[in-house]
């Protein structure tokens, strides 16, 4: 059960809902965005104020952390299982410190299982946050401070902070160090979406959300 199913059941107010893992009774709490683009979006990541530390372990990124009412990571295992069942789209919403907003929409998104290090798969980019994907293609394995699966002889997660699908180390990291306004430029380990704001610019807010492609 995801936010799209909840929306279709008649619950159309954005907020925290209890979702269930596919083919399981295991539950997880998530923020459902029922307003953006027709609603039904399961929010899998959100940054807004730096209140949550995103330099976490593999286990924490696997299971999720933070609060769905604020900053959080839903959890790689749930997202992997969910996106393995049906075709999902991924929408990434970004805000800078100058009041601008942009988005990237991928028309097919899924995460491989833990045995494949939750490798990300993405196709079909559209949107206003750059014509080139800021998540390297083909998709990379997920890396954290205690699980280095990137393509760099360095350790991307330790240098750039946070868990992410680092390449070597690549043009994005929405789980980087949060920097407040006036401290957000020329930061090499911040919240980055290169093909929108270039290098060294740390964003104000980010949201990653998924929804079935046939919603």
């Amino acid at each position: 059960r995801d936010c799209a199913e909840i929306f279709k059941s008649g619950l159309t107010t954005s907020g925290i809902y209890t979702l269930t893992f596919p083919n399981s009774t295991e539950e997880i709490k998530a923020y459902c965005d029922m307003d953006v683009g027709g609603g039904g979006w399961t929010v899998i990541q959100h940054r807004e104020d730096g209140s949550v530390d995103f330099q976490r372990t593999w286990k924490e990124y696997k299971e999720g952390f933070g609060s769905p009412l604020g900053e959080y990571w839903l959890g790689n295992e749930f997202v992997s299982q969910l996106t393995g069942q049906h075709r999902y789209v991924l929408k990434i919403q970004l805000k800078d410190w100058e009041g601008n907003e942009a988005h990237s929409l991928y028309d097919h998104f899924y995460l491989a299982g833990e045995e494949s290090n939750y490798r990300i798969h993405l196709t079909g980019l559209t949107g206003t946050a750059g014509k080139i994907s800021s998540i390297s293609q083909p998709g990379s394995d997920f890396s954290t401070k205690d699980s280095d699966n990137d393509k760099c002889i360095c350790k991307c997660s330790q240098m750039l902070s946070g868990g992410w699908w680092f390449d070597a180390c690549g043009p994005s990291n929405l789980n980087g160090q949060y920097y407040p306004q006036k401290q957000n430029t020329n930061k090499f380990n911040g919240i980055k979406w290169y093909y929108w704001k270039g290098s060294g610019y740390s964003l104000k807010a980010t949201t990653m959300m998924i929804r079935p492609a046939d919603f």
Epitope: K155, L160, F188, K192, S199
Partner: antibody, heavy 121, light 107 residues
């Protein structure tokens, strides 16, 4: 392979300007940035500033602020550095060097061959 | 600005010797440090980045270590072609800054 080829030797009078070019080949220009570094005779390395090959964002060393301008021409994959109001102590070899801007890695590889700028009356 | 202090300023060593060059940063860099080699009349060449990652094609006798504010470049079994000046560079924040250099001479 990746190459950075700089323009030739320049001799300038005090108060003049110089514009050095750095033509690149062998990689995706927009994924990288360029630092400009100079080396006065017998001295160490001094960073002048940086420009993004993606969007032209710049960051200049405080010492050169207002006197240096860095630009790029994506159509020719070329970076430029102009230094104005030249003084005799600006005599140096000026290098351009590439970084992995899109990864936020600002170590420099490769470097151009260098351009000797001599300022003398 | 982050100040980078290199020592020694010069060293004279024999072929086969181990040479250690240190670099101290005025504030913590995590692992955002690179080492370069420069021979007379040529441009610097990147040897090591991320404090300890050897650049492709660089001989394994070169190694880097350290994090935070203290870093070192070690040349194991110095070779005749290793003469030149070595520089450290911080890549933690703009402005990028270099150490003053260490001149390595072969005895």
């Amino acid at each position: 392979q990746v190459q950075l080829v700089q323009s030739g030797v320049e001799v300038k009078k005090p108060g003049a300007s110089v514009k050095v070019s750095c033509k690149t080949s062998g990689y995706t220009f927009s994924n990288n940035g360029f630092s400009w570094v100079r080396q006065a005779p017998g001295q160490g390395l001094e960073w002048l500033g940086w420009i993004s090959g993606y969007n032209g964002n710049t960051n200049y060393a405080q010492k050169f602020q207002g006197r240096v301008t860095m630009t790029t021409d994506t159509s020719t994959s070329t970076a430029y550095m102009e230094l104005r109001t030249l003084r005799s102590d600006d005599t140096a070899v000026y290098y351009c060097a590439r970084d992995q801007d899109y990864s936020n890695f600002h170590w420099l590889d490769p470097w151009g061959q260098g351009t000797l700028v001599t300022v003398a009356s | 600005d982050i100040q980078m202090t290199q020592s020694p300023s010069s060293v004279s060593a024999s072929v086969g010797d181990r040479v250690i060059i240190t670099c101290r940063a005025s504030q913590g860099l995590s692992s955002w440090l690179a080492w370069y080699q420069q021979k007379p009349g040529t441009a610097p060449k990147l040897l090591i980045h991320s404090a300890s990652s050897l650049q492709t094609g660089v001989p394994s006798r070169f190694s880097g270590s350290g994090s935070g504010t203290e870093f070192a470049l070690t040349i194991n079994s110095l070779q005749p072609e290793d003469f030149g000046t070595y520089y450290c560079q911080q890549a933690n924040s703009f402005p990028l800054t270099f150490g003053g250099g260490t001149r390595v001479e072969i005895k």
